[in-house]
Amino acid sequence: FSIMENNGQPCINDDEEMKEVDLPEIEADSGCPQPVPPENGFIRNEKQLYLVGEDVEISCLTGFETVGYQYFRCLPDGTWRQGDVECQRTECIKPVVQEVLTITPFQRLYRIGESIELTCPKGFVVAGPSRYTCQGNSWTPPISNSLTCEKDTLTKLKGHCQLGQKQSGSECICMSPEEDCSHHSEDLCVFDTDSNDYFTSPACKFLAEKCLNNQQLHFLHIGSCQDGRQLEWGLERTRLSSNSTKKESCGYDTCYDWEKCSASTSKCVCLLPPQCFKGGNQLYCVKMGSSTSEKTLNICEVGTIRCANRKMEILHPGKCLA
């Protein structure tokens, strides 16, 4: 018996010594009963009895993916030859957190790479990291079920003032990075244009120094600095930002010509290239992807294309000469 037409060499599976033609002949009514699929899995070609040499494919339910070798083979003794296969969750389940914490965005399942933000009622901050990312089937960093809210010293200090400021009598003055920032505040990845270096800084210290007119400090992203796309884009964005006509304060960040400020998350979100304004003075001559032709784009279009991580080479500022 062969499950494939024999038009040449009988196939040998990886790590399998026996050829199909070497399998002993069997009675038609013998074979293997339906195997038990792994948890959250099912058998694709389901039936009551399988012939010797026949393979079944293990598939996983939506939200899960197969890890390991997903084929079982029916052996002459009526058992199944099966490797280690399991259905691993490819999405993260909404974490269970204390009632006082709000999860944004609020969904039942989150795809790999999606992040959630935990927030507290006004005047309180999360006593630990506030941003978590779905990686595989778990959250990074792990979410402690004892995570709660604590009184926000930043809010208490600032009163009705801007971030990085505090109330002093009837006026607002800059916080002192040394004196006013001894309490816990979340980590930010920050770029210093003077030293041309990036580093992790507590939010309070960053805001206080920015308030003291340290214009060379630029917010890159929430959380400690880690190599990767987020950091790359943060650095490139900082370089482009010096020519932006729009500089709109947005939480820790500043939004530029190619961005909108998301009020609910206090984050800058990049537009799509077709959503950009037309014209403008800040123009660049670029080469797109693998194209050899040059194209003049404005700063908004350049920002959106780079934000979307599309290939583009900036040849020089200003219009293309040709």
């Epitope: 965005p105 998301s262 009020a263 998350t265 800058c268 799509l272 934000c307």
Partner: antibody, heavy 123, light 106 residues
């Protein structure tokens, strides 16, 4: 859950004005672009334009520019599509749809669609 | 504007068969997105960024392609898959949809 609920069916005469609505719930209305899409009877989908309720920024399909006005009232999480003078050719189903964002960039597609509003213009 | 041409206009197949829907762009697009629409219902996001299935979409659906040629494939049709499918681009203004492919039961 995230929902876009549109106003009921409308029957109008040519030359009349009309404003249809799209009420959002379950998400931060100000932070997402709302788009309007037309579907004429038995036909395909046509993008009309969009609004960003956070700052009332709009983008229109040149084919619809000047024909309709898109607006929003973020205090009641509602977007609007309006005509000052309807024509028989405006007879169609109109959908509002949300353009989401993922990570730190908006996306090119619509992840949530409204219930649809049928507009009939006939003398 | 970028014109998206879907073919065939109508595809008549039986449950269990494989369906291949095509969408051709008049000029190169970065990504293509697909929606499903059933009679009397609103469209629903089906495949985004060329090949990613939207939440809850079965694994029998897959998307592929690049440049100007894109495909939506259904490996083995189920009765609930019969509907109209639209492709969509927004690489350049205005955002455009294909005219749709009606997938009907043979």
């Amino acid at each position: 859950q995230v929902q876009l609920v549109q106003s009921g069916a409308e029957v109008k005469k040519p030359g009349e004005s009309l404003k249809i609505s799209c009420k959002a719930s379950g998400y931060a209305f100000s932070d997402y672009w709302i788009n309007w899409v037309r579907q004429m009877p038995g036909k395909g989908l046509e993008w009309m334009g969009q609004i960003y309720p956070g700052d009332d920024d709009t983008n229109y399909n040149p084919s619809f520019q000047g024909q309709v006005t898109i607006s929003a009232d973020k205090s009641i999480s509602t977007a609007y599509l309006q005509w000052s003078s309807l024509k028989a050719s405006d007879t169609a189903m109109y959908y509002c749809a949300r353009e989401g964002y993922y990570g730190y960039t908006y996306v090119e597609y619509f992840d949530v669609w409204g219930t649809g509003t049928t507009v009939t213009v006939s003398s | 504007e970028i014109v998206l041409t879907q073919s065939p206009a109508t595809l008549s197949l039986s449950p269990g068969e494989r369906a291949t829907l095509s969408c051709r762009a008049s000029s190169s697009v970065s990504y293509l997105h697909w929606y499903q629409q059933k009679p009397g219902q609103s469209p629903r996001l089906w495949i985004y960024d060329t090949s990613k299935r939207a939440t809850g979409i079965p694994a029998r659906f897959s998307g592929s392609g690049s440049g100007t040629d894109y495909t939506l494939t259904i490996s083995s049709l189920e009765p609930e898959d019969f509907a109209v499918y639209y492709c969509q681009q927004w690489t350049s203004n205005p955002l455009t949809f294909g005219q749709g492919t009606k997938l009907e039961i043979k």
